[in-house]
């Protein structure tokens, strides 16, 4: 999906009002400097691409974050403020339902969400170019 035509300010507002709190709650108990920041993004569409990938794509050691509160709110924000986004996700959602696993917070998931916090922080930068 090409995130170029999203309403970035509305997504930013959704992040500041709720998603950020849910990320904080997920990370509760984690040490501030436990994880290095290794994922970056250069503009807002790129940030959303990376956010979508880390939030919804299973990775080794972290089967799924998609049912977490921050992920569901991220999905809702993208569906509302990115034209055509929800249509592209129907097939992906069907596939995810088939392989959903028991929800377990692993260290790898915490590291992944730490990277997500960094990506969201970059997305919110007022001077970050749109494209």
């Amino acid at each position: 999906y090409d995130f170029t035509n999203c309403d970035f300010e509305k997504i930013k507002a959704a992040y500041l009002s709720t998603i950020s709190k849910d990320l904080i709650t997920y990370m509760s108990g984690t040490k501030s400097t436990e994880f290095n920041n290794t994922v970056s993004c250069s503009n807002r569409p790129h940030c959303l691409t990376e956010i979508q990938s880390l939030t919804f794509n299973p990775t080794a050691g972290c089967a799924s974050l998609a049912k977490e509160m921050f992920a569901m709110k991220t999905k809702a924000a993208l569906a509302i403020w990115c034209p055509g986004y929800s249509e592209t996700q129907i097939n992906a959602t069907q596939a995810m339902k088939k392989r959903r696993k028991r929800k377990v917070t692993t260290n790898k998931c915490l590291e992944q969400v730490s990277q997500l916090q960094g990506l969201w922080r970059r997305f919110n930068r007022p001077l970050l170019k749109q494209q």
């Epitope: 108990g29 984690t30 400097t33």
Partner: antibody, heavy 118, light 107 residues
Amino acid sequence: QVQLLQPGTELVKPGASVKLSCKASGYTFTSYLMHWVKQRPGQGLEWIGEIDPSDSYTDYNQNFRGKATLTVDMSSSTAYMQLSSLTSEDSAVYYCALTGTINYFDYWGQGTTLTVSS
Amino acid sequence: DIVMTQSHKFMSTSVGDRVNITCKASQDVVTAVAWYQQKPGQSPKLLIYWASMRHTGVPDRFTGSGSGTDFTLTISNVQSEDLADYFCQQYSSFTFTFGSGTKLEIK
């Protein structure tokens, strides 16, 4: 181990500028955010702003925009804070402090005592 | 900005006593609260993060509790070396803010 080294004192005249330093060691400089915190004598702590050494992006407390400018020198793993148009209100201890993506401060410098006096 | 209020500027206690230092946030900060100890002439030191997690090397007589808007740092069996200023800080929302501090005095 992580260390943040700051000079002990700076004495500057009113109206002048000063550049405070914070030399980091014991970790990868670009991995974490560097913050600056102000403490006036006998008072509380006030967050000034943060800089991401990986790309020099800064965020400031609104109260310090135009007063403080944060920079880094990658070659020496040193963070700087320049304070401009100094007045007696700027006399304080200034700390650098370190965080990851979660913004509480596990590591602090020893602080630089800035005195603004003619 | 979120205001962190420490209603007691000073608290007096005796060695061996138990003392509660409180901090109130002006809005919900979940459990994103840290506590710092600052001894005279020193930089602040992290005691507690995530409202109740003890930082490495902090004696277990220091305990944090609370969530939402009300937070407490409890020092049980107070020692003379606990004479210090104690600050709370919220990191739930930008701008990160501190309480004004509570000075613990030993009788």
